[in-house]
């Protein structure tokens, strides 16, 4: 007995060949002996079996002795062993339809975990393995799942089910819904303004959600709520601001903020969460804020940082053109009775200046100019 | 077991629509094709078509252009509309079940039966 | 759509008689036929199916034959209870359609 492999929602077709290649009398009828399908002479006709509707031929092979039931809009109820009868002989088919879905969405955060879920009809014993957009092999019988999603993971599933030696290919689209980058930071001097961007990692047709910035200061013993805001139909509208600092925010996607000057007080971490409309959990994305400050009094030259930096980060005081006179991985560096000219002070890693600040120091007898 | 039970107006106008609900007791709607059979004085048995829940209705083609046959399965309930009636729809209508298993296809539970009556 | 024609239209017959009602199509349904029994004011009930297949709980008086075309359903010795209307259908195509019917009447 011959056996074909069909997916949910596709179409089949089953071949039935004569001897003769002429247009001759045949039957398809299911395992019931009901008729799904024949023909009286030249027309085609068709028994009440649950096929009626989708069940089909193709007359213009008739001539040529090729007798196909073709089958639209396949159920896994479908399944079922399908006998042609042409020639006082009978043919059998087997068709074993097969359903691959995903759990509840195929739009998940990250993090999350995917469920797949094989329909299959009684009586079978399918064995499936999935290949992820990057490449990572899974196997499973009934249902497979990953959990902790990545961004990686987003893309198109191929899945193949294996049964009697045959094999149907699925392919499943996943859209993991998460920020761009997991963190960023901004490195500023004083007084600058800062830009946020909080591009998002997929497109969807509505976006709909609502989401905060909580921001930790460095200086400040807890965290606080600096902006609330909505977003519907990818329109962003802000609920609620604090008054220090007045944060301002752009009105269409990707997410923008803007803090009208960078300040050592506003030096430190937040954190910008993203609930979206019928999904459970929040995109997560992690922003820091490192602020440079330098500054002359009377006869000491400081170089100072606030914010999260890493303990490799080299801050450094030089003299343009010369070499650095006192290079730390510190936060704060100081040059005693500083020579007149421009010095630059400079927060490199592995010699890559991430941020930078000049300052004028005149002779000793007039005032320092920051340029 | 399964009962089936028809319900509608035993009077319509010519020209009005018949409109006729049939209720499945005893099992679900949604696992057979579900049929309506007329019966007059001078058609004898004529089905009128039928309807399972995944699939579209087939109708007879003698009726197809004014008949509708529609299934809610939260009330385990299916329907017949019948519109643009004249005296020759003047018919007793069973609703039916139609079951397939080995070698036979065909109605195997009837409702009681309900006259329906064209005149003005 | 597949025609059926019964005959006879009406018949009389006695208790312990034989009764032979015929059916034919008009095209071959193979064995795709099954045979009603109508008692008035109530629904059909199927008797005989595939042609010559004896329903569950159907006594074994009633028989049916022939394939094709041509069909013939018999009570070989007809009890009081069998007085009814007799019905042919055929499934070998949509629409499902009937005889006109056969009414055994008591002589």
């Known amino acids: 007995k011959k056996v074909v492999l069909g997916k949910k929602g596709d179409t089949v077709e089953l071949t039935c060949t004569a001897s003769q290649k002429k247009s001759i009398q045949f039957h398809w009828k299911n395992s019931n002996q009901i008729k799904i399908l024949g023909n009286q002479g030249s027309f085609l006709t068709k028994g009440p079996s649950k096929l009626n509707d989708r069940a089909d031929s193709r007359r213009s092979l008739w001539d040529q002795g090729n007798f196909p039931l073709i089958i639209k809009n396949l159920k896994i109820e479908d399944s079922d062993t399908y006998i042609c009868e042409v020639e006082d002989q009978k043919e059998e088919v087997q068709l074993l339809v097969f359903g691959l879905t995903a759990n509840s969405d195929t739009h998940l955060l990250q993090g999350q975990s995917l469920t797949l879920t094989l329909e299959s009809p009684p009586g079978s014993s399918p064995s499936v393995q999935c290949r992820s957009p990057r490449g990572k092999n899974i196997q499973g019988g009934k249902t497979l799942s990953v959990s902790q999603l990545e961004l990686q993971d987003s893309g198109t599933w191929t899945c193949t089910v294996l049964q009697n030696q045959k094999k149907v290919e699925f392919k499943i689209d996943i859209v993991v819904l998460a920020f761009q980058k997991a963190s960023s930071i901004v490195y500023k001097k004083e007084g600058e303004q800062v830009e946020f961007s909080f591009p998002l990692a997929f497109t969807v047709e509505k976006l709909t959600g609502s989401g905060e910035l909580w921001w930790q200061a460095e200086r400040a013993s807890s965290s606080k709520s600096w902006i609330t805001f909505d977003l519907k139909n990818k329109e962003v509208s802000v609920k609620r601001v604090t008054q220090d600092p007045k944060l301002q925010m752009g009105k269409k996607l990707p997410l923008h903020l803007t803090l009208p000057q960078a300040l050592p007080q506003y030096a430190g971490s937040g954190n910008l969460t993203l609930a979206l409309e019928a999904k459970t959990g929040k995109l997560h994305q992690e922003v820091n804020l490192v602020v440079m400050r330098a500054t002359q009094l009377q006869k000491n030259l400081t170089c100072e940082v606030w914010g999260p930096t890493s303990p490799k980060l080299m801050l450094s005081l030089k003299l343009e053109n010369k070499e650095a006179k006192v290079s730390k991985r510190e936060k704060a560096v100081w040059v005693l009775n500083p020579e007149a000219g421009m010095w630059q002070c400079l927060l490199s890693d592995s010699g890559q200046v991430l941020l930078e600040s000049n300052i004028k120091v005149l002779p000793t007898w007039s005032t320092p100019v920051q340029p | 077991q399964v009962q089936l039970q028809e319900s509608g107006p035993g009077l319509v106008k010519p020209s009005e629509t018949l409109s006729l609900t049939c209720t499945v007791s005893?099992?679900?709607?949604?696992?057979?094709?579900w049929s309506w059979i007329r019966q007059s004085a001078g058609k004898g048995l004529e089905w009128i078509g039928r309807i399972y829940t995944s699939e579209r209705p087939n109708y007879n083609p003698s009726l197809k252009s004014r008949v509708t046959m529609s299934v809610d399965t939260s009330k385990n309930q299916f329907s017949l509309k019948l519109n643009s009636v004249s005296a020759a729809d003047t018919a007793v209508y069973y609703c039916?079940?139609?079951?397939?298993?080995?070698?036979?296809?065909?109605?195997?539970?009837w409702g009681q039966g309900t006259t329906v009556t064209v005149s003005s | 759509d597949v025609q059926m024609t019964q005959s006879p239209s009406s018949l009389s017959a006695s208790v312990g008689g034989r009764v032979t009602i015929t059916c034919q199509a008009s095209q071959d349904i193979s064995n795709y036929l099954n045979w009603y029994q109508q008692k008035p004011g109530k629904a059909p009930k199927l008797l005989i199916y595939y042609a010559s297949n004896l329903e569950t709980g159907v006594p074994s008086r009633f028989s049916g034959s022939g394939s094709g075309t041509d069909f013939t359903f018999t009570i070989s010795s007809l009890q009081p209870e069998d007085f009814a209307t007799y019905y042919c259908?055929?499934?070998?195509?949509?629409?499902?359609?009937f005889g006109g019917g056969t009414k055994v009447e008591i002589k």
């Open positions: 039916a079940r139609e079951l397939e298993r080995p070698y036979y296809y065909g109605m195997d539970v």
């Open positions: 005893g099992g679900s709607i949604s696992t057979y094709y």
């Open positions: 259908q055929q499934y070998d195509n949509l629409p499902l359609t």
